[in-house]
């Protein structure tokens, strides 16, 4: 570490005087402090001199004395306070910027020691600090403003008791920069536009930071339109705002417009799309299959996207039947906008009713006209089966009726013994019958088929099941003859077990 | 309809000064940049400069830099160029043009000729 | 500053004929952000104020017919005038809108034969 000469931490001369700094260190070294007149600086190897036969109060200050070949970067100082009578304060900037936030040294240093005691910080023309300042003062380095404000931008002077008057320094402007987090907030306003051709349109590009030094613009298609700025200043944030007033669009002003602000710390941008459309438009759709199929005691939402400008006049669901006069209920019929022009319309049906089967029809106007969407609801069943023993054509037959949607299809089966049902190991023969008559087929109503299995001999302690399945579930019928040997009776002379 | 309506014709004498007014209907005020233009016989149309009409700021040709000064009165939707120091130089009819958001004049007052002359 | 510059300074033409006008630039008018050309043509009659014909170098302004036709880029443009008409008569100026100063050329003066 270099060692100076006089070894004192401070040293206190009178205007006039002179003073010489010797520094030695194992190398070479180097001296550093205010920038004042008068010094001469001679320098032999290991040691350097700074000398002044004259000093002045501007020569006040701190000099250092560094080794730049020493590794570990040590340095030695001694404080010069050179005290003249009719100059208290030596002020080494004139103007300071610092961030919020951040501590101001202003440094004006003090040429006597002994005025310590005495001095102050004020604002210019003898108006006191803005409430809140905190400061502290350091006779070597001047008046500290900790934490500073971008309010605390004034200017300052360094005040000491002198003889029982005060005497100033020349001023210090503080300039407190705002920390500017990021490029300048925006927003583009509306985040969509559809206009008729002729109507009007405005399109507002904002931007706002706590810095006023930022651009903005709004450009459409890539080109940057000639838009006068407004400007304003609240909540502590600059605004700029261009508004783009179209009083009659047409096609030319359709497309892609993108508002811009950047400022030092880089660039912000949002879009927006606008079109223009020759008249008013009603678009109904669904993502979902207008033929729905359900199975009965379930529930269904049917929902319905509307496009359309300008916006509805008028909505409902209506339920177009077959089986009654119901109407849908309002409480199940919910609307949410997706956002100025799109729509989502539900329906809610939930533990649908046989008699809730057939059309609902979701009907929108706007000044584009009506429209419809009709949705076709067909209830899912699963079979239900029975079994009669009869004669056709002089033959025994056990006729099978079989109702359900979709339609189902027919198994017979013959087992041995007496049971409610068949099971694999009672299996005796089984047919299917892949073409059953359709008895009945209506639009929204259960299918019902019917399957004939001829028996020439019904065999008693046997049991013939109709089995009917679809892609709901199953249902079956097992008939069990209770006789005495007869091969063909008449039904009435039989029982039959569902 | 979207109108420049400029005061009238201005008779004056050399130094002395005039203020020629250019008053706007049918559109938003504030929302175009409001021109000036000069149109004499030996110069064709020259351009003297604009008027931010919301800030009142102002961008002007260097030639007319201290020769014109604009000014706005949002209220009545006017817009004034003032003339100083006036030579037989400054002769000239003056128009008032609206600058459309793509950069070209769309709506033109009809001019106010001014004479200088002793 | 920009310089403009027209020619021919005057032409007279017949009822039916086509006309040309040329104006140049001393640098470029195109913007290579949007690759526009920041040039407009305006049609000034007798005793009225400028009226604008053509924007964009080539973009017509609602309501002028489409016998005028403006074309070019970079720093030659040209006004097409296909089949002339006696209320053509005017002087034709060309503005840049590219930078300011905005600059005008010093006119092409149509007279009909």
């Known amino acids: 570490i270099p060692v100076i000469e006089p070894s004192v931490p401070e040293l206190v001369v009178k205007p006039g005087a002179t003073v010489t700094l010797r520094c030695v260190g194992n190398g070479s070294v180097e001296w550093d402090g205010p920038p004042s007149p008068h010094w001469t600086l001679y320098s032999d190897g290991s040691s350097s001199i700074l000398s002044t036969n004259n000093a002045t109060f501007q020569n006040t200050g701190t000099y250092r004395c560094t080794e730049p070949g020493d590794p570990l970067g040590g340095s030695a100082a001694i404080h010069l306070y050179v005290k003249d009578p009719a100059r208290p304060w030596n002020v080494l900037a004139q103007e300071v910027v610092v961030f919020e936030d951040q501590d101001a040294l202003l440094p004006c240093l003090l040429t006597d020691p002994v005025l310590e005691a005495g001095v102050s910080l004020v604002r210019v023309r003898g108006r006191p600090l803005m409430r809140h300042t905190n400061y502290s003062f350091s006779p070597w380095h001047g008046f500290t403003i900790h934490r500073a404000k971008f309010i605390q931008s004034q200017d300052y002077q360094c005040s000491a008791l002198m003889g029982g008057r005060k005497v100033m320094s020349i001023s210090i402007r503080l300039k407190v920069q705002k920390v500017i987090p990021g490029p300048p907030a925006l927003t583009l306003v509306p985040a969509e536009l559809v206009r008729i051709r002729g109507e009007a349109a405005q399109i507002v590009c904002s931007a706002s930071s706590v810095d006023v030094n930022f651009d903005v613009f709004l450009q459409h298609n890539n080109t940057k339109l000639a838009i006068p700025q407004q400007s304003d200043f609240h909540n502590n944030r600059y605004q700029k705002v261009l508004t783009l007033n179209l009083d009659q669009v047409d096609f030319q002003h359709a497309g892609n417009y993108s508002c811009v602000a950047s400022n030092v710390q880089g660039k912000h941008s949002t879009s927006m799309f606008f079109r223009v459309v020759e008249s008013a438009y009603l678009n109904l759709s669904s993502e979902q299959n207008l033929i729905q199929e359900v199975t009965v005691g379930e529930g269904l939402n049917l929902k319905v996207m509307v496009e359309a400008y300008p916006g509805l006049q008028g909505f409902n669901w209506t339920y177009l039947g077959p089986f009654s006069d119901h109407q849908p209920e309002p409480k199940l019929a919910n609307a949410t906008t997706k956002d100025t022009y799109r729509h989502t319309f539900t329906l809610s049906l939930p533990r649908l009713k046989p008699s809730e089967a057939g059309r609902y029809s979701f009907l929108a106007r706007n000044p584009g006209g009506w429209r419809a969407l009709t949705f076709e609801l067909t209830l899912r069943y699963p079979p239900e089966v029975s079994v009669i023993w009869t004669f056709i054509n002089g033959s025994g037959t056990l006729l099978c009726a079989a109702s359900g949607y979709p339609q189902p299809n027919v198994t017979w089966l013959q087992c041995s013994g007496h049971t409610d049902r068949c099971d694999e190991a009672q299996v005796l023969q089984v047919w299917d019958d892949p073409y059953p008559e359709v008895l009945s087929q209506e639009p929204f109503h259960k299918v019902t088929v019917q399957s004939l299995l001829t028996v020439e001999t019904l065999e008693h302690n046997q049991t013939y099941e109709c089995r009917a399945h679809n892609s709901v579930g199953s249902g079956s019928w097992a008939f069990i003859p209770i006789s005495a040997g007869a091969h063909t009776h008449p039904p009435d002379e039989f029982l039959f077990t569902p | 309809e979207v109108r420049l309506q400029q005061s009238g014709p201005e008779l004056v004498k050399p130094g002395a000064s005039v203020k020629i007014s250019c008053k706007a209907s049918?559109?938003?005020?504030?929302?175009?940049?409001m021109h000036w233009v000069k149109q004499s016989p030996e110069k064709s149309l020259e351009w003297i400069g604009e008027?931010?009409?919301?800030?009142?700021?102002?961008t002007y040709n260097q030639k007319f830099t201290g020769k014109a000064t604009l000014t706005v009165d949002k209220s009545s939707s006017t817009a004034y160029m003032q003339l100083t120091s006036l030579t037989s130089e400054d002769s000239a009819v003056y128009y008032c043009?609206?600058?459309?958001?793509?950069?070209?004049?769309?709506?033109w007052g009809a001019g106010t000729t001014v004479t200088v002359s002793s | 500053d920009i310089v403009m510059t027209q020619s021919p300074s005057s032409l007279a033409m017949s009822v039916g004929q086509k006309v040309t006008m040329s104006c140049k630039s001393s640098?470029?008018?195109?913007?290579?952000?949007?690759?526009?050309?920041?040039l407009a043509w305006y049609q000034q009659k007798p005793g009225q104020s400028p009226k604008l014909l053509v924007y964009?170098?080539?973009t017509r302004d609602s309501g002028v017919p489409d016998r005028f036709t403006g074309s070019g880029s970079g720093t030659d443009f040209t006004l097409t005038i296909t089949s002339v008409q006696t209320e053509d008569l005017a002087v034709y100026y060309c503005?840049?809108?590219?930078?300011?100063?905005?600059?005008f050329g010093s006119g092409t003066k149509l007279e009909i034969q």
């Open positions: 503005q840049q809108d590219y930078s300011t100063p905005f600059t």
């Open positions: 008027i931010n009409p919301n800030t009142g700021s102002c």
């Open positions: 640098q470029t008018l195109l913007n290579s952000n949007d690759q526009k050309n920041y």
């Open positions: 043009a609206r600058l459309n958001y793509y950069w070209y004049f769309d709506v």
């Open positions: 964009f170098a080539s």
């Open positions: 049918g559109y938003t005020f504030t929302g175009y940049y």
